[in-house]
């Protein structure tokens, strides 16, 4: 797995450089987490044919996966520090369980997986830190996750292919925007 | 292979709006990280950003012309419009679309087209 | 705005001299940096991306350095064809802004 932002060798390296600041910290972390992404795409891409499949949106009904509409305040039209914050902080939550449906689902990158769930973790503290208005963060329900995580994996094989690849993209689209909205903050 | 071909008006009279046209192949806005700018260039000056546009239709305009500038895309032509409006003669310049794409959305311009002249 | 600010505006060189061109941001862009040359009635060509990335089909003779707000693009052995306008770029904030330039020229 690669090595957590903060501890690169460029950072040993310049001992006297300025701390990064709240904004660099996340900004650093989602890019940290996108590498981690693009690794485990690899080996989902390269296991299957799922990438190229035109087959995503019967797989994608079933799944209800976090995504930045304009209503959110993420955009350029009515972009909305506060509102923002609060998609991209909930969203993240959401992803939680399809991130936890991501363990055990890749055999040479599986330190990987592990590292992008922890990473998430770690980038919703940041984020949290940042926030003024937690009370409108809603947590996802315990109970409502646990049998999504169940009727996931209790899915045929092309499915669990399918839902993996489908998780990948959506979590990358989404971190993307993040990183878009949160440069304006 | 990625390409990108400008087209639109070679003349434009003063206080008219300008429609320039980017369409472009090799890539589409369905994969995110994807977006595709405007940048003019009046004669022997430098290059000056004007308008970007992403894979999910977010978009950004220079500061200095917002009012003036309006960019849309049509996903199943495969084609980027910029509109500029209330033209003046220092509006003269060569005027590029370009594409960024990368993880990071870095805004590194990997493709250009050829470029209009306008006048 | 992010002010890029270029040096020198031009430079004269023979083939085969080390050059370096400068760019400096008006404020902290961490890695968000990239260069373009223009030829002589061409379109920019992306050379450097984030600062020291290379770009497939650029020639290794191009290089760049730099963090936070000074940068630079080396070039180790000028060829006659890297006769141009270099231009760097700031990708961290909009709008997006590019430096004056520096062209290059052969004495």
């Known amino acids: 797995a690669p090595v957590p932002p903060g501890e690169d060798s460029k950072d040993v390296a310049a001992p006297h450089r300025q701390p990064l600041t709240s904004s660099e910290r996340i900004d650093k972390q989602i890019r940290y987490i996108l590498d981690g992404i693009s690794a485990l795409r690899k080996e989902t891409c390269n296991k299957s044919n799922m990438c190229e499949s035109s087959k995503e949106a019967l797989a994608e009904n079933n799944l209800n996966l976090p995504k930045m509409a304009e209503k959110d305040g993420c955009f350029q039209s009515g972009f909305n520090e506060e509102t923002c914050l609060v998609k991209i902080i909930t969203g993240l939550l959401e992803f939680e369980v399809y991130l936890e449906y991501l363990q055990n689902r890749f055999e040479s990158s599986e330190e990987q997986a592990r590292a992008v769930q922890m990473s998430t973790k770690v980038l919703i503290q940041f984020l949290q830190k940042k926030a003024k208005n937690l009370d409108a963060i809603t947590t996802p329900d315990p109970t409502t996750n646990a049998s999504l995580l169940t009727k996931l994996q209790a899915q045929n094989q092309w499915l669990q292919d399918m839902t993996t690849h489908l998780i990948l993209r959506s979590f990358k689209e989404f971190l993307q925007s993040s990183l878009r909205a949160l440069r304006q903050m | 292979q990625v390409t990108l071909k400008e087209s639109g008006p070679t003349l434009v009279k003063p206080t008219q709006t300008l429609t320039l046209t980017c369409i472009f192949s090799g890539f589409s806005f369905k994969t995110s990280g994807v977006s595709v700018g405007w940048i003019r260039q009046p004669p022997g000056k430098a290059l000056e950003w004007l308008a970007l546009i992403y894979w999910d239709d977010d978009k950004r305009y220079s500061p200095s012309l917002k009012n003036r500038l309006t960019i849309t895309r049509d996903t199943s032509k495969n084609q980027v419009v910029l509109t500029m409006t209330n033209m003046d003669p220092v509006d003269t310049a060569t005027y590029y679309c370009a594409r960024s794409y990368d993880d990071y959305l870095y805004y590194a311009l990997d493709y250009w087209g050829q470029g209009t002249l306008v006048t | 705005d992010i002010v890029m600010t270029q040096s020198p505006a031009t430079l004269s060189v023979t083939p085969g001299d080390r050059v370096s061109l400068s760019c400096r941001a008006s404020?902290?862009?961490?890695?968000?940096l990239h260069w373009y040359q223009q030829k002589s009635h061409e379109s920019p060509r992306l050379l450097i991306k984030?600062?020291?990335q290379s770009i497939s089909g650029i020639p290794s003779r191009f290089s760049g350095s730099g963090s936070g707000s000074d940068f630079t693009l080396s070039i180790n052995s000028v060829e006659p064809e890297d006769v141009g306008v270099y231009y760097c770029?700031?990708?961290?904030?909009?709008?997006?802004?590019f430096g004056a330039g520096t062209k290059l020229e052969l004495k």
């Open positions: 770029q700031n990708g961290h904030s909009f709008p997006l802004t």
């Open positions: 984030s600062v020291s």
């Open positions: 404020q902290s862009i961490s890695d968000y």
